[in-house]
């Protein structure tokens, strides 16, 4: 079969299938789409996922390429690392094998890039420019088990047809995901259609066992069932329901699962609990009950906003920092007369790319819930979880469609109360003065309604939240930041956005990246998103300074002192990678453990400006975090570097604050 | 050495149609995607289309609205661009490229090995 | 379609002069930019892929840089059979490829 006819294909082992799409996407593009679909772009780490990939890919033309999720910032080579410096977009640079076109050569690394895999010959990985769209890209599924291909039967009409969660439909899978169903013809005109299960007794299999094409007895009162009867191998029969409805506790009736509201927002028949609850937009699942849903917090994606975001419940809006304005696209800053410009983000707007209807403005407005957040140059997404299908999977939709999904209701959110405690709350406490808006502030805008202040005791002292002041010595006032409000019930005054700023140090050559961000602190309603740091800088946490607005009685001031640890490396057996080259076969490299960063439970991203000697890998399971890429828009003039969370009990290090990124980029993360 | 020969000079009258050629030598002519191009006397570069000799696919510019037609002759490693309905501003130099696909471990879009180029006038 | 201005138009210089030519993008084409060089009645040569790669045989004084908008064809110091037309090409919504005007060198 020809891997590059208009049908995607796959290929599944027990635990993970691949896919290809053979259609001409940008590397955003293509990452996009296997997002929708619950997977990612392929990350072939080991000879093993390699040999699943080049059996998918097969022999194809030699002009044709796949592109697979590796991506590398501008200025961010690292020859020595078997990646150099590419990372996956899963968020870590672990590999077992690599595939380069080419030997590493030494070069500045102007611009970003990203990596596609040749159709042809040894499937070799060539890097690029992410914003080409080249002829398809490579998906990989991860799931909890799969069922094996049904075995062919005597009375079949033909193969048995079989679907995955992910929309692939073909007679050719050796391994179904989890949540795939199989579609089974008989020669006696019935079939049945089997649901690949969590079994009882542990692990997956077929919803029902062969064989499923024989004999009789439904035919007198369709066999006592209200909707469908089917004949089982020795002769009995069992009543099935029609889609949206499950069999009740007598076996013959059938009833509708989402009669009793099981979901607290959309309730969708059919899956294996009968079931599944959806959220919409704008809310995903609790983590704790699939069936609640709670805000999503939208600023938490890289490069939602270029400048500052807020999320309230169920979407985002972006701002600009005094002195610009908001471009039409509703992220990006201009300079301007104007100030405090905003542009509701109802997700849907543009994080899909295909416009559904807008939710009125002002609706939005009523559910706003709080928070600012000062969006770095390039942030990192918090880990996703892949979809659970032990819930109902989405309805397929068209190709080059984006699925419709209904705008969330707004509700206002709950009056305030004491911060939810984040991810690693304890190391926070001590690592990284964890700057949060407690307030609603109000917003400039002329669509908004009145914001009631919510009112509350006084937050005991482990929930306070601490200020941050700052300056950044000897700067021009053109590049001078402004300062966030962090004020629990008083409001920033109309048309003056609020901002962070921390005292620095110093300030650092323009030529130097920036740090990529951190994982993302959650705050009530509330997050300030803070970006990694580089070790070998102390942070300096300055009482309030002249610039800082009026304070509430209840918002207390950080008052710390700064300790410079030192990163003490650990050992690491050095990684061996499988390396494939164009001039001989399959070889191992072991990487010199001289090459190898420590082994530290961190969760700073490993990329670093080219002159950091002791880049930190993210070898910690924590610490592979996704990352989203972004096309287009120029980096802003300043980035504002935080100190950062990491599990360990020493403070982390002062980044750099780079003045600099005036090149556009060729992609950017999201 | 890889070498694109394209066919000669071609004096069409308005309304005719013109076929020219571009034999590939020096690669294997199904791995690299063929595309057509044409430069008017004082204009840059327009792009007319492309063919991928692996499987036939062809795209074209919106511009030329059915009027080109991008055909191989894979035994003879050829391609062909024919023009339709010639008017008098299709005079230009026509130009076949070969598109790259890898170069020192990059994959890149350019053009890297062109046609002479063919001149063809219309004229009433 | 993405328009290229390339500046200047014309240019007389000298042997040995260093030269740099501008291609401006009407939007963001990444890095999907190249620069070629075309004699009269001659084929164009690919000098510099993917705004900032010089191709294989290419002299090292030819070099391109930038990214996004703006992009720049330098040659060090001038030889004499540099003297030719100069343009880019973005190819950023491949296959939908747009030219600059070209930039005409001359010998002062």
């Known amino acids: 079969q020809d891997p590059w006819a208009a049908e995607p294909r796959s290929a599944c082992g027990p635990s993970s299938c691949y896919a290809l799409f053979p259609r001409r996407r940008t590397f955003l593009e293509a990452w996009r789409a296997c997002r929708e679909l619950g997977g990612d772009l392929a990350t072939p780490r080991t000879p093993e996922e390699a040999q699943r990939v080049d059996n998918l890919v097969g022999a194809g033309p030699a002009s044709r390429l796949l592109w697979i999720g590796l991506q590398r910032q501008a200025r961010q080579c690292q020859l020595q690392r078997p990646l150099r410096g590419f990372t996956w977009t899963t968020g870590d640079q672990d590999t077992a094998f690599t595939n380069w076109a080419q030997p590493a050569t030494g070069g500045p690394c102007p611009a970003q890039r990203c990596v596609a895999l040749e159709a042809s010959g040894e499937h070799r990985w060539l890097e690029g420019s992410c914003t080409l769209a080249v002829d398809g890209y490579l998906c990989q599924f991860g799931f909890e088990g799969a069922c094996p291909a049904l075995q062919d039967e005597a009375g079949q009409a033909g193969p048995a047809v079989y679907t995955t969660p992910f929309h692939l439909v073909s007679t050719e899978f050796e391994w179904l995901p989890f949540g795939s169903v199989a579609a089974v013809q008989c020669q006696a005109g019935r079939g049945a259609s089997l649901l690949c299960v969590k079994q009882p007794e542990g692990g997956v299999g077929w919803s029902r066992a062969g064989p499923l094409c024989l004999g009789a007895g439904c035919s007198p009162d369709n066999g006592g069932c209200e909707h469908e009867c089917v004949e089982e191998v020795d002769g009995h029969v069992s009543c099935r329901c029609t889609e949206g409805f499950r069999l009740a506790a007598d076996g013959r009736s059938c009833e509708d699962p989402c009669a009793q509201a099981p979901c607290e927002q959309q309730c969708e028949p059919g899956g294996p609990q009968g079931y599944s609850c959806h959220c919409r937009l704008g809310f995903r699942p609790a983590e704790d009950d699939p069936h609640r849903c709670v805000d999503t917090d939208e600023c938490q994606i890289a490069g939602v906003c270029q400048q500052m975001c807020v999320n309230y419940v169920g979407g985002f809006e972006c701002y600009c920092s005094e002195g610009h304005e908001l471009e039409a696209d509703g992220i990006s800053c201009s300079p301007a007369g104007a100030m405090g410009a905003r542009a509701s983000q109802d997700l849907g707007d543009e994080l899909l790319d295909d416009g559904e209807d807008e939710e009125d403005e002002d609706e939005a407005w009523e559910a706003f819930g709080g928070g600012w957040t000062e969006m770095p140059g390039i942030l990192w997404m918090e880990p996703t979880q892949p979809p659970d299908f032990a819930l109902a999977y989405r309805p397929s939709f068209p190709e080059d469609r984006e699925p419709q999904i209904p705008y969330p209701e707004p509700t206002w959110p709950p009056p305030l109360s004491a911060p939810r405690v984040p991810y690693h709350s304890s190391v926070l406490s001590v690592t990284r003065p964890v700057v949060v808006s407690a307030t609603r502030p109000t917003l400039p805008s002329a669509h908004q309604p009145p914001v009631i202040p919510a009112t509350h005791p006084a937050l005991s002292r482990d929930h306070q939240i601490p200020v941050i002041a700052a300056n950044y010595p000897d700067l021009p006032s053109a590049y001078q930041p402004g300062i966030l409000s962090v004020s629990h019930p008083a409001q920033p005054p109309a048309h003056q956005p609020p901002m962070i700023s921390t005292r620095y140090p110093e300030l650092f050559p323009a030529h130097q990246s920036p740090m990529f961000p951190d994982t993302q602190v959650a705050g009530t309603q509330t997050t300030t998103h803070l970006p990694a740091i580089p070790p070998n800088r102390a942070p300096l946490v300055t009482t309030l300074g002249a610039h800082q607005p009026p304070q509430a009685p209840d918002a207390p001031v950080l008052r710390t002192q700064a300790t410079q640890l030192p990163i003490i490396p650990t050992a690491q057996p050095s990684l061996t990678t499988s390396s494939r080259s164009p001039v001989s076969p399959a070889h191992q490299v072991s990487v010199p453990a001289a090459t190898q960063p420590p082994a530290l439970p961190t969760l700073l991203p490993s990329q670093s400006p080219t002159n950091q000697t002791s880049p930190i890998s993210p070898t910690h399971p924590h610490s592979k975090v996704p990352q989203i890429p972004r096309e287009d828009g120029p980096s802003p003039k300043l980035a504002l570097w935080l100190p950062s969370a990491a599990p360990t009990a020493a403070p982390t290090a002062l980044g750099e604050a780079s003045l600099a990124e005036h090149i556009q980029r060729d992609d950017r993360w999201l | 050495q890889v070498q694109l020969v394209q066919s000669g000079p071609e004096v069409k009258k308005p309304g005719a149609s013109v076929k020219l050629s571009c034999k590939a030598s020096g690669y294997t002519f199904t791995d690299y995607v063929i595309h057509w191009m044409r430069q008017a006397p004082g204009q840059r570069l327009e792009w007319m289309g492309y063919?991928?000799?692996?499987?036939?696919?062809?795209t074209y510019n919106q511009k030329f609205k059915g009027r080109v037609t991008i055909t191989l002759d894979t035994s003879a490693s050829t391609a062909y661009m024919e023009l339709n309905s010639l008017r008098s501003e299709d005079t230009a130099v026509y130009y076949c490229?070969?598109?790259?696909?890898?170069?020192?471990?990059?994959?890149?879009?350019?053009?890297?090995?062109w046609g002479q180029g063919t001149l063809v006038t219309v004229s009433s | 379609d993405i328009q290229l201005t390339q500046s200047p138009k014309f240019m007389s210089t000298s042997v040995g002069d260093k030269v740099t030519i501008t291609c401006r993008a009407s939007?963001?084409?990444?890095?999907?930019v190249a620069w070629y060089q075309q004699k009269p009645g001659k084929a164009p040569k690919l000098l510099i892929y993917?705004?900032?790669n010089r191709y294989t045989g290419v002299p090292s004084r030819f070099s391109g840089s930038g990214s996004g908008t703006e992009f720049t064809l330098t040659i060090s110091s001038l030889q004499p059979e540099d003297f030719a037309n100069y343009f880019c090409?973005?190819?950023?919504?491949?296959?939908?490829?747009?030219f600059g005007q070209g930039t005409k060198l001359e010998i002062k």
């Open positions: 993917s705004a900032s």
């Open positions: 490229a070969r598109r790259g696909n890898s170069y020192d471990g990059y994959f890149d879009y350019s053009m890297d090995y």
């Open positions: 090409q973005q190819y950023t919504n491949y296959p939908m490829y747009t």
């Open positions: 939007q963001n084409v990444g890095t999907a």
């Open positions: 063919i991928n000799p692996y499987d036939d696919d062809t």
